[in-house]
């Protein structure tokens, strides 16, 4: 039951995280005009990964897309790439994890297959979350660098006669959404990996009872396991399924390896 809960929760957390990563990537407020210690402007500038916007005091908002690809800073391109990779991996991870969910039955899919799929999706979520966190962090670092550079040259002008105010940008809402979403996806991925351990076919479920037959040392295993000859020779007892799909209760009724003292 704990495995199902962990897997289900991991899936939900990752789903929320990926939705957040998509939202952050689409948001326009990656960087927003710094209003502190600046002249009070009648416009509010903010920028996203895909376009920059200006909101006038009347409420009128005008956005312009970055219609150039080659003219954009390499860092911005890198952030875009990281976010897109994160979304793609996350989306594939979600697709895989749906089929891996223990509560969903698809034909006679074996638990080992579900375990592998759970692990795969977990890893995908972890990488997706890391991509999002990395993308947001790179952008934040870029902002911090530019912020202090523009603070150093807050006013530039010809002989001090004409002043040009340099608009400073600070962290926008999308950065926080991205960090949180990336973190959630990462946590969801870890949960999926933990769930995978519980789903994976275990080692010997019951302590074998040795019956010493004439001249042979045979360890009899419970149904579903092949007998291993040579006491203690098979250190990694592999579970060999007898073809029949077990019910959920049957699977959960076996003690796990953690039950052994």
């Amino acid at each position: 039951m704990a495995v199902t809960a962990c897997q289900g929760l991991g899936f939900v957390v990752s789903l929320i995280g990926i939705a957040g990563i998509i939202a952050a990537t689409c948001m326009d407020q990656w960087s927003t005009q710094d209003l502190y210690n600046n002249p009070v402007t009648a416009v509010f500038n903010y920028q996203g990964l895909w376009r920059s916007c200006v909101r006038e005091s009347s409420g009128f908002t005008e956005c312009r897309g970055y219609f150039t690809l080659l003219g954009l800073p390499a860092m911005l391109q890198a952030v875009r790439a990281l976010m897109i990779v994160g979304i793609v991996l996350g989306a594939i991870g979600l697709l895989v994890s749906i089929f891996a969910l223990k509560c969903i039955r698809i034909g006679s899919m074996e638990d080992s297959a579900k375990a592998n799929m759970t692990l795969t999706s977990g890893i995908m979520f972890i990488v997706s979350g890391l991509c999002a966190i990395a993308g947001v962090s790179v952008f934040a670092n870029m902002l911090v660098t530019n912020f202090w550079m523009s603070t150093a040259n807050m006013y530039t002008g010809m002989g001090g006669m004409v002043q040009t105010v340099q608009t400073r940008y600070t962290f926008g809402a999308a950065l926080f959404v991205g960090w949180v979403a990336g973190g959630l996806t990462l946590i969801g991925g870890v949960m999926m990996c933990i769930a995978c351990r519980g789903l994976a076919p275990e080692e010997t479920n019951y302590k074998a009872v040795s019956y010493h037959a004439s001249g042979h040392s045979v360890a009899y295993k419970p149904g579903g396991f092949k007998a291993s000859t040579g006491f203690g020779s098979n250190t990694k007892n592999k579970k060999i399924y007898d073809g029949g799909a077990r019910t959920e209760d049957e699977v959960q009724s076996y003690p796990s390896k953690h039950d052994y003292v």
């Epitope: 416009v43 004409v162 002043q163």
Partner: antibody
Framework: DVQLVESGGGLVQPGGSLRLSCAAS????????MHWVRQAPGKGLEWVAY????????YYVDKLKGRFTVSRDNAKNSLYLQMNSLRAEDTAVYYC?????????????WGQGTLVTVSS | DIVMTQSPPTLSLSPGERVTLSCKSS????????????LAWYQQKPGQAPKLLIY???TRESGIPDRFSGSGSGTDFTLTISSLQPEDFAVYFC?????????FGGGTKVEIK
């Protein structure tokens, strides 16, 4: 047709108070920011204050902060300017103007103005 | 505060003449976010309220004749009346629309010669 009508002006003694009103019609008042601008006799225009459609933010010219208060009642389609501790230099024609939408913050419609005279 | 300087203070001209009014701001009115200039021009006739002619430094307000045109960027702006009409004799003000307080220039009076 957009119409802005100011009222409440008149003669007031120095140190006195006055409340100007601006009645708006012909447009959705609650969707627009509004300005007060004044013009001393024979002088140029001086921007006084701005109030956004939702009453926040509000901006004032520094020298009038604390003495003048701008407010609005969207239900009544009205804009107000409360003027306290009036001085002789506050004598001017006071205009209310609409903050135009998609006109780069320009003031697209103006009222005819109301004259405020501060004199003893 | 942004200081708006208009020149000349007075212009004496005849109908049909071309008029060029100048406006300079102490700070750039070009917003980097959208590369637009936030400057407006107004016309005021005696006893009347000001009327918006040009916004965004160069965009004519609807209903304004095309003889009026605005140009310039950053700190230097110009209002041009291609052929002065009798109804154009008035005072013209420029206004900073980017920074609060939204300061006006001192005005240029265009009078009949």
């Amino acid at each position: 047709d957009v119409q802005l009508v100011e009222s409440g002006g008149g003669l007031v003694q120095p140190g006195g108070s006055l409340r100007l009103s601006c009645a708006a019609s012909g447009f959705t008042f609650s969707s627009f920011g509004m300005h007060w601008v004044r013009q001393a006799p024979g002088k140029g225009l001086e921007w006084v204050a701005y109030i956004s459609s939702g009453s926040s933010p509000i901006y004032y010219v520094d020298k009038l902060k604390g003495r003048f208060t701008v407010s609005r009642d969207n239900a009544k389609n009205s804009l107000y300017l409360q003027m306290n501790s009036l001085r002789a230099e506050d004598t001017a024609v006071y205009y209310c103007a609409r903050a135009g939408y998609a006109v780069r913050n320009a003031l697209d419609y103006w009222g005819q103005g109301t004259l405020v005279t501060v004199s003893s | 505060d942004i200081v708006m300087t208009q020149s000349p203070p007075t212009l004496s001209l005849s109908p049909g003449e071309r008029v060029t009014l100048s406006c300079k701001s102490s700070q750039s009115l070009l917003n980097v976010g959208n590369q637009k200039n936030y400057l407006a021009w107004y016309q005021q006739k005696p006893g009347q309220a000001p009327k918006l002619l040009i916004y965004g430094a160069s965009t004519r307000e609807s209903g304004i004749p095309d003889r009026f045109s605005g140009s310039g960027s950053g700190t230097d702006f110009t209002l041009t009346i291609s052929s002065l009409q009798p109804e154009d004799f008035a005072v013209y003000f420029c206004q900073n629309d980017l920074f609060y307080p939204l300061t006006f220039g001192g005005g240029t009076k265009v009078e009949i010669k």
